[in-house]
């Protein structure tokens, strides 16, 4: 049996109360695909949400988070409070990263500093709450007499300028 409603276009619904003719979606509702028997209610961006894209007859509204919050979940289903760099959000609010950990973003958790010694390297720049450590060459590379990766430049003869 063919669906009599399958050809009602997006932005409309197949109106059973009017002998299955296509009717436009009422205000504050939408249908993003054709052949719908009802229109969906538009999402409202309220409270910590702000409107990124208005609802139309064929597409739902899209929300963002207000300043000081960031989106979580599919289609920004939740807003989470921002923290400063060097902090993470806990149940009690924003807390500084513990020693040995860092967070370089306004969201997410504090992560441990890189352990340079695991790669046989040394710490070039110490870590902070906001930044990871920077690993440098291994201590062996820095010891006297270690062979250099670049050969020494050839000596020039006196009185000769370079080509």
């Amino acid at each position: 049996l063919q669906d009599l409603c399958s050809n009602c276009p997006a932005g409309t619904f197949c109106d059973n109360n009017r002998s299955q003719i296509c009717s436009p979606c009422p205000p504050n509702s939408f249908s993003s695909a054709g052949g719908q028997r009802t229109c969906d209610i538009c999402r409202q961006c309220k409270g910590v949400f702000k409107t990124r894209k208005e609802c139309s007859s064929t597409s739902n509204a899209e929300c963002d988070c207000i300043s000081g919050y960031h989106c979580l979940g599919a289609e920004c289903s939740m807003c989470e409070q921002d923290c400063k760099q060097g902090q993470e959000l806990t149940k009690k609010g924003c807390k500084d990263c513990c020693f040995g950990t860092f967070n370089d973003q306004k969201r997410g958790i504090c992560r441990p500093w890189t352990n340079c010694s695991l790669d046989g390297k040394s710490v070039l720049v110490n870590g902070t709450k906001e930044r990871d450590v920077v690993c440098g060459p291994s201590p062996a590379d820095l010891s006297p007499g270690a062979s250099s990766a670049t050969p020494p430049a050839p000596a020039r003869e006196p009185g000769h300028s370079p080509q």
């Epitope: 669906d3 050809n7 009602c8 276009p9 197949c14 009017r18 002998s19 299955q20 003719i21 009717s23």
Partner: nanobody, 121 residues
Framework: EVQLLESGGGEVQPGGSLRLSCAAS????????MGWYRQAPGKGREFVAA???????VYAESVKGRFTISRDNAKNTVYLQMSSLRAEDTAVYYC???????????????WGQGTLVTVKP
């Protein structure tokens, strides 16, 4: 309330032409398919032509190449241009609002009251 009002019928000689109009109101015309049907004396109602909101058209074999269906969404009106008319085209012509914007296997949700077309020498 849905209203469909046909006009343009009359008497014409074989080989002649007529243009039927159907003025629609009470619904969103531009998103719905419209059709023309006819009923000859002593016979059942039969499909003639239909046009979708997107302007796809379908015709009965008996009128293909002779009749043209069109629509003007700004005027909420559907037309049936009939040419090379034959005696067997004599019938009451009805405008129909089709269910679900369908022109394939169409089903009529609302009918007009009809306009008579008579083809005779």
């Amino acid at each position: 309330e849905v209203q469909l009002l046909e006009s343009g019928g009359g008497e014409v000689q074989p080989g002649g032409s007529l243009r039927l109009s159907c003025a629609a109101s009470g619904f969103s015309f531009s998103i719905n398919a419209m059709g023309w049907y006819r009923q000859a004396p002593g016979k059942g109602r039969e499909f003639v032509a239909a046009i979708e909101s997107g302007r796809n058209t379908v015709y009965a074999e008996s009128v293909k190449g002779r009749f043209t269906i069109s629509r003007d969404n700004a005027k909420n009106t559907v037309y049936l241009q009939m040419s090379s008319l034959r005696a067997e085209d004599t019938a009451v012509y009805y405008c129909g609002l089709l269910k679900g914007n369908r022109v394939v296997s169409p089903s009529v949700a609302y009918w007009g009251q009809g306009t008579l077309v008579t083809v005779k020498p």
